[in-house]
């Protein structure tokens, strides 16, 4: 372990499509991967007319986009499907949308996931 870095061993798991995919709907997912590579958690969601619909949450493989991110924050401006990743156990329990604007000051859009 590297000092000052939170290692990810488990993430919140959610699958909106659980019946079709034949998985659990929600739970805790242990994260596997090559021993020397970093592991992360992710969340994906949609914003349907202002209502937040979680699509999936779970483990994410080694990705420099997620390094040292303790919070799960989507920064892309108005994506079709929102995606964020983070490091640290269960760091994907909460997620938010904070688009990086070119000129204007960014405004935070915190997301409170609806319980399944």
């Amino acid at each position: 372990a590297i000092l000052g870095r939170s290692e990810t061993q488990e993430c919140l798991f959610f699958n909106a499509n659980w019946e079709k995919d034949r998985t659990n709907q929600t739970g805790v997912e242990p994260c596997y991967g090559d021993k020397d590579k970093r592991r992360h958690c992710f969340a994906t969601w949609k914003n349907i007319s202002g209502s937040i619909e979680i699509v999936k949450q779970g483990c994410w493989l080694d990705d420099i986009n997620c390094y040292d991110r303790t919070d799960c924050v989507e920064k892309k401006d108005s994506p079709e499907v929102y995606f964020c990743c983070c490091e640290g156990n269960m760091c994907n329990e909460k997620f938010s949308y904070f688009p990086e604007m070119e000129v204007t000051q960014p405004t935070s859009n915190p997301v409170t996931p609806k319980p399944p």
Partner: antibody
């Protein structure tokens, strides 16, 4: 073990399109990216684009923008790369690779463009 | 993003060490630790050897090592063996906000 299995060789006419598939197994398909790379005969590797397998978000190399479409089907753990308006210079072996580090590769698919 | 620059070929005798360079710019190789090295034997798919500049991929012999100085990343192979004869490519991480790019490749000949 992680495996990426690609579809078979294709022979295409100039102006047509080709769609190459890449079926993943041995890991959770929706836990990373799938990248596409091509290699013309006797030439080096050329990055074409990537897809986030869970969100469907894509990025393409400028050279292929507007001509390439990368998609992913979660239900079958399969990624696809479609290249349109084919020309003879597109004759190459096309590879898919897992993740941002390209840590596992498919066996390659030879696409020959010839009239 | 423009291609990374590699020497066309390098050679060495068994047991010797060789170093392959990969030069980029201050905005890619110089700024981030995201350069990787791939080995490709004729007719085969490339194989990841080194990722994140200096991390050895699982199962890769410790004869292979990676480093970086300024805008140039390097792959060093010590104790050259006949099976090391192959093409070697440097490349960058690709995914999310990062776009991929490869070097032109270096042919390593073991004399």
């Amino acid at each position: 073990q992680v495996q990426l299995v690609q579809s078979g060789a294709e022979v295409k006419k100039p102006g047509s399109s080709v769609k190459v598939s890449c079926k993943a197994s041995g890991y959770t398909f929706t836990s990373s990216y799938i990248n596409w790379v091509r290699q013309a005969p006797g030439q080096g590797l050329e990055w074409m684009g990537t897809i986030n397998a869970v969100s469907g978000s894509t990025s393409y190399a400028q050279k292929f923008q507007g001509r390439v479409t990368i998609t992913a089907d979660e239900s079958t753990s399969t990624a696809y790369m479609e290249l349109s308006s084919l020309r003879s210079e597109d004759t190459a072996v096309y590879y898919c690779a897992r993740g941002g580090w390209f840590d596992y590769w498919g066996q390659g698919t030879l696409v020959t463009v010839s009239s | 993003q423009s291609a990374l620059t590699q020497p066309r070929s390098v050679s060495g005798s068994p047991g010797q060490s060789v170093t392959i360079s990969c030069t980029g710019t201050s905005s890619d190789v110089g700024s981030y630790n995201y350069v990787n090295w791939y080995q490709q034997h004729p007719g085969k798919a490339p194989k990841l050897m080194i990722y994140g500049v200096s991390k050895r991929e699982s199962g890769v012999p410790d004869r292979f090592s990676g480093s970086k100085s300024g805008n140039t990343a390097s792959l060093t192979i010590s104790g050259l063996q006949a099976e090391d004869e192959a093409d070697y490519y440097c490349g960058t991480f690709a995914g999310g906000k990062y776009y991929g790019v490869f070097g032109g490749g270096t042919k390593l000949t073991v004399l």
